[in-house]
Interface confidence: low
């Protein structure tokens, strides 16, 4: 077990803070909830603290919760491939470019680390080149989320990982908005981290609303499990 993994044996409180600017529309989001890496489970509630969110909530899910991939459930035979937990408590910097097909792009930078007993994800997001009447600024996405696989590979030069995946957002007219994600994670501290073999995270997400919440918000439940690496031969012959 890595030193960082020991921090994730129980339920951990999570705080998410985002400052965003998309085509000049500035906004802030604050999120709170809990993560339980034993089950690969996240429950979070996000509130737009600046009024109405200028982009659809589903476009921010990867920035919020795929940001705290340290809560992914890594089966016993894959624990040596869990970069995310091994970087804790000092944490990691997570940078992404998200290309929305036939529309603009988000660039994000986040620091994910422990502050006391709380896992904090602080994010800056900049969005440019979006069409004012497109699927994103035109709020044409359905309020739901599909399952995805998130592909991870080691980046030995940077002592971190590279990640890429394609998100499928459902549009109200029945079509799909693709969002290509290119991600890089590097440790904040200088302690040893686990550099993984190629594998993927399997994600399931459900979006809902709090009937008692008057502010623009999103409630998120997510399960994330690592997969894609089989048991070694020594395991088979035990």
């Amino acid at each position: 077990m890595s030193k960082g993994e020991e921090l994730f044996t129980g339920v951990v409180p999570i705080l998410v803070e985002l400052d965003g600017d998309v085509n000049g529309h500035k906004f802030s989001v604050s999120g709170e909830g809990e993560g339980d890496a034993t089950y690969g489970k996240l429950t979070l509630k996000f509130i737009c603290t600046t009024g109405k969110l200028p982009v659809p909530w589903p476009t921010l899910v990867t920035t919020f919760s795929y940001g705290v991939q340290c809560f992914s459930r890594y089966p016993d035979h894959m624990k040596q491939h869990d970069f995310f937990k091994s970087a804790m408590p000092e944490g990691y910097v997570q940078e992404r470019t998200i290309f929305f097909k036939d529309d603009g792009n988000y660039k994000t930078r986040a620091e994910v680390k422990f502050e006391g007993d709380t896992l904090v994800n602080r994010i800056e997001l900049k969005g440019i080149d979006f069409k004012e009447d497109g699927n994103i600024l035109g709020h044409k996405l359905e309020y739901n989320y599909n399952s995805h696989n998130v592909y991870i590979m080691a980046d030995k030069q940077k002592n971190g990982i590279k990640v890429n995946f394609k998100i499928r957002h459902n549009i109200e007219d029945g079509s799909v908005q693709l969002a290509d994600h290119y991600q890089q994670n590097t440790p904040i501290g200088d302690g040893p981290v686990l550099l993984p073999d190629n594998h993927y995270l399997s994600t399931q997400s459900a979006l809902s609303k709090d009937p008692n919440e008057k502010r623009d918000h999103m409630v998120l439940l997510e399960f994330v499990t690592a997969a894609g690496i089989t048991h070694g031969m020594d395991e088979l012959y035990k």
Epitope: E34, D36, K41, T43, N144, S147, A206, S208, L221, F223
Partner: nanobody, 120 residues
């Protein structure tokens, strides 16, 4: 609950559980099992507000949980059954999404249970 019974190893069973609408909607429905002398174990659960599932490692790839929203009913399809699957199986309902995958303490409503016996 219904659908329990006796079966040979390698066989299949399908359990079903109907819940009151208010208990079912946007909550977590779970299947638990308890073998004699053992603790109650969460086998599978489904968040009815988003159709996402949790499975215990011991049943992954063999058991499938599904839901029928119109009937407020959940199902547990159990394939490739093993003798170690022998237990009393309980259906339970939690409050909201957090219950899924969080163990028995997070579940509020419980069924009477149905026995599943797998012989070799």
């Amino acid at each position: 609950e219904s659908g329990g019974g006796s079966v040979q190893a390698g066989g299949s069973l399908r359990l079903s559980c109907a819940a009151p609408r208010s208990t079912y909607t946007s909550n977590c429905m779970g299947w638990f099992r308890q073998a004699p002398g053992k603790e109650r174990e969460e086998v599978a659960s489904i968040y009815t507000g988003g159709d996402i599932t949790y499975y215990a490692d011991s049943v992954k790839g063999r058991f499938t949980m599904s839901q029928d929203n119109a009937r407020s009913t959940v199902y547990l399809q159990m394939n490739s059954l093993k003798p170690e699957d022998t237990a009393m199986y309980y259906c339970a309902a939690g409050r909201g999404s957090w219950s899924c995958g969080s163990g028995p303490d997070e579940y509020k409503y419980w069924g009477q249970g149905t026995q599943v016996t797998v012989s070799s």
